[in-house]
């Protein structure tokens, strides 16, 4: 039969799945079927287990005791559970690994001991668990790696020691875990690593050292030849050395943000053929562009806030698959030709020292959609610099030294920013930009060429009916945007506004001519000048 209040169902193999979770039980049910294969006793009030409390459950494969009040598990608690593969003891109040109770669970593959109060792991506690594949020890009170206890777990494939108080990883801490694929050590207090602390982890693919107190780059990773995913973000690492990942050619992902990294060795990221994304912000001591030889599949490269003054002419030869390049906030003056980077979709070079865009700089970048060159010192742009960029829709040249602006090839632009180019005083014809939605110009009179004056009045009058908004609200010069008084109407407003803009072929241009600066006067002033 099925124990009172429990839910029982066949498991499809002539055996029984029994769910007695969250029933307020203080002891184990007594009338369990010998043919039970799954027993869930989690989220109850069980505070102790007697020796041999589950007699004759020789077919039991999964036992869940999570979320109870167990402080101790006696020897013999799991006697006779010859088929047990999964044992869940998380969210209890255990203070040490129940060594005696775990003996002879030869079939056990998964053991959850997370979210207890375990501060001690006896040296021989896992010695009989020859089949163990997954071990959870996270969210406990461990202060050191239980090195000896792990020596018997040669079949272990995944382990988490996260959310403990571990401060050091000694040499060969995991020396016998040759099958381990995943190791989580995040959210500890690790400040030092033995030079050989990861030696022996020949199958490791994922290593998580995030949220620790590491002061130095973890060079011990160099023996992890199968490592695919590495995290050491949110530490206190200040530099990444030369050849940092030389032993990890399989790396696909590296997370190292939220470290005060100032310096990166030029060869640090070489020979990582699987790496797709590399992001490094604020490494102010980098003066040279990294040598990315052998890291040819990089799709996104962000290297901002450094002191890079030049790029190698062959930069694109190394990075033929690059789609996103962000080198903003550097000291770049000259630019190489990016034309070999055929897959580039986005380039961000704002806040550099660039003074000229040559004819070949961005030639034949057929996929380029966004180009940001704002806050440079660009005075010269070759007339055909943008002539072979058929996909370009966003171009930002604001805050440069332009006195003229070449329009060739820019007919597909939807966003154009030229604000802050004080020497750029000529009018730009709207006919060159049939797709334009947003344009920012140095001067308000330049918006008149885009029909902003009349259209702005038409739309404002239309939307002013029954509305007490002031004209100032409707003509925000700095934003060039209309304000909506009632937030609930925002979505409707934007939809209708978009339709109106389409209907009127209007462009959002700033700084917008206001009612006190009508286009006639502005244009008169420009003509006189």
């Amino acid at each position: 039969g099925c124990p009172t209040h429990c839910h029982c169902e066949p498991d499809g193999r002539m055996l029984l799945r029994v769910d007695c979770s969250d029933l307020g039980l203080s002891e184990l049910p007594s009338n369990l079927s010998v043919f039970t294969s799954y027993l869930d006793l989690s989220m109850n009030n069980i505070s102790q287990l007697l020796p041999n409390p589950l007699p004759s459950l020789r077919f039991l494969e999964e036992l869940r005791l999570a979320g109870n009040a167990l402080t101790y598990i006696p020897k013999g608690a799991f006697t006779g559970l010859y088929s047990l593969k999964v044992l869940m003891l998380q969210n209890n109040q255990l203070r040490q690994v129940p060594t005696e109770a775990l003996q002879n669970l030869r079939s056990l593959q998964s053991l959850r001991l997370d979210a207890n109060h375990i501060s001690y792991v006896p040296p021989s506690c896992f010695s009989g668990l020859h089949s163990l594949r997954h071990l959870w020890l996270d969210d406990n009170a461990l202060t050191e790696i239980p090195v000896q206890a792990f020596r018997s777990l040669s079949a272990l494939q995944a382990m988490t020691l996260a959310l403990n108080k571990i401060h050091h990883i000694p040499d060969y801490a995991f020396g016998n875990l040759s099958s381990l694929v995943v190791l989580h050590l995040h959210n500890n207090r690790i400040h030092s690593l033995g030079k050989k602390c990861f030696d022996g982890l020949h199958s490791l693919e994922t290593l998580d050292l995030n949220y620790n107190n590491l002061d130095e780059f973890p060079t011990a990773i160099r023996t992890l030849s199968n490592l695919k995913e590495l995290g050491f973000h949110s530490n206190n690492i200040r530099s990444i050395p030369e050849k940092a990942f030389v032993g990890n050619p399989s790396l696909i992902t590296i997370h190292f943000y939220d470290n005060p990294i100032q310096f990166v060795g030029r060869s640090a990221f070489q020979h990582l053929p699987e790496l797709r994304t590399l992001t490094l912000n604020g490494a102010s001591q980098i003066t040279e562009f990294p040598d990315l030889t052998g890291t040819a599949n990089l799709e996104s490269l962000t290297l901002t806030g450094a002191q890079i003054s030049s790029l190698p002419q062959t930069v694109c030869n190394q990075l033929p698959n690059l789609q996103v390049l962000d080198l903003s906030y550097n000291l770049l003056e000259d630019l190489p030709s990016f034309s070999v980077c055929q897959k580039l979709q986005k380039i961000d070079l704002r806040h550099n020292e660039i003074y000229e865009i040559k004819v070949d700089t961005f030639q034949q970048l057929l996929s380029l959609r966004s180009l940001n060159l704002a806050w440079n010192k660009i005075a010269i742009i070759h007339p055909n610099a943008f002539s072979t960029l058929p996909s370009l829709i966003k171009l930002d040249l604001s805050s440069n030294l332009l006195s003229s602006f070449p329009v060739t090839g820019l007919h597909g632009l939807t966003h154009l920013k030229l604000t802050g180019n004080h020497a750029l005083q000529s009018l730009i014809s709207s006919e060159n930009f049939p797709e334009l939605k947003i344009i920012e110009m140095p001067y308000a009179y330049q918006c008149c060429a885009f029909g902003v004056c009349e259209n702005a009045y038409k739309i404002s009058n239309q939307w002013n009916k029954g509305d007490n908004s002031s004209m100032d609200d409707l003509h925000k010069k700095d934003a060039g945007m209309f304000q909506v008084q009632d937030e609930r109407d925002l979505e409707d407003f934007l939809l209708d506004f978009e339709e109106d803009l389409k209907a009127l072929h209007s462009v959002q241009c700033s700084p917008s001519p206001g009612p006190f600066k009508p286009c006639e006067h502005l244009l008169d002033g420009w003509l006189i000048r």
Epitope: P123, E144, I145, V147, Q148, R151, P170, D171, Y172, A173, G175, N176, K195, K196, D199, G200, H202, T219, R222, T223, L224, S225, P241, E242, K243, V246, G247
Partner: antibody, heavy 118, light 111 residues
Framework: EVQLVQSGAEVKKPGASVKVSCKAS????????IEWVRQAPGQGLEWIGE????????DYNEKFKVRATFTSDTSTSTVYLELSSLRSEDTAVYYC???????????WGQGTLVTVSS | DIVMTQSPDSLAVSLGERATINCRAS??????????MHWYQQKPGQPPKLLIY???NLESGVPDRFSGSGSGTDFTLTISSLQAEDVAVYYC?????????FGQGTKVEIK
């Protein structure tokens, strides 16, 4: 099958340098340390130092720090020991060995006899 | 440096009898419960061969008549039943700290 094959015997004059090679095969070259050990005729074993191939990670016995240099070439899976300023007491068989389980030396090269004689 | 002292320097044992070699370290070579002590066998004209790692773990392929024990500073290699092919020099080695050091060797012969 793991193998370490060393270069042939060398005869050198005092003050000269010698470069011994150790070619590894049968395992992931960059995942294991290579140790260098020497044995003078009829004597015991003396550890010179270690290198993790492909990286700049090296450790030298203080006694050899000034004169010994370890290098590696990942393209050929070869590690090198160069010993300079040779003297007669450097006459020995020089072994490379792989640092295996817990740093024990689980595979050894056949040894290279270096004779220093004027 | 950690000094490794083996005793005896040489040992003659009858075939089938037990041979015991001791090794003492000048300081403990234990770390986090592991004893960083290894044993090697070297036959004439050959490189050393690993027998035992971490004081008591038998290396793969090594006959089980070889065993190791001890911790801290005192360690023992035992050959439970000496065979003719066991004639060799045996070395202990520590890799607890640099420089890694070897014992002076113990020569095992047949009585």
């Amino acid at each position: 099958e793991v193998q370490l094959v060393q270069s042939g015997a060398e005869v050198k004059k005092p003050g000269a340098s010698v470069k011994v090679s150790c070619k590894a095969s049968g395992y992931t070259f960059s995942a294991y340390w290579i140790e260098w050990v020497r044995q003078a005729p009829g004597q015991g074993l003396e550890w010179i130092g270690e290198i993790l191939p492909g990286s700049d990670s090296t450790d030298y016995n203080e006694k050899f720090k000034v004169r010994a240099t370890f290098t590696s070439d990942t393209s050929t899976s070869t590690v090198y020991l160069e010993l300079s300023s040779l003297r007669s007491e450097d006459t020995a068989v020089y072994y490379c060995a792989r640092g295996g389980h817990y740093g024990s030396l689980d595979y050894w090269g056949q040894g290279t006899l270096v004779t220093v004689s004027s | 440096d950690i000094v490794m002292t083996q005793s005896p320097d040489s040992l003659a044992v009858s075939l089938g009898e037990r041979a015991t070699i001791n090794c003492r370290a000048s300081e403990s070579v234990d770390n986090y419960g592991n004893s960083f002590m290894h044993w090697y066998q070297q036959k004439p004209g050959q490189p050393p061969k690993l027998l035992i790692y971490l004081a008591s773990n038998l290396e793969s392929g090594v006959p089980d008549r070889f065993s190791g024990s001890g911790s801290g500073t005192d360690f023992t290699l035992t050959i439970s039943s000496l065979q003719a092919e066991d004639v060799a020099v045996y070395y202990c080695q520590q890799n607890y700290e640099d420089p890694f050091t070897f014992g002076q060797g113990t020569k095992v012969e047949i009585k």
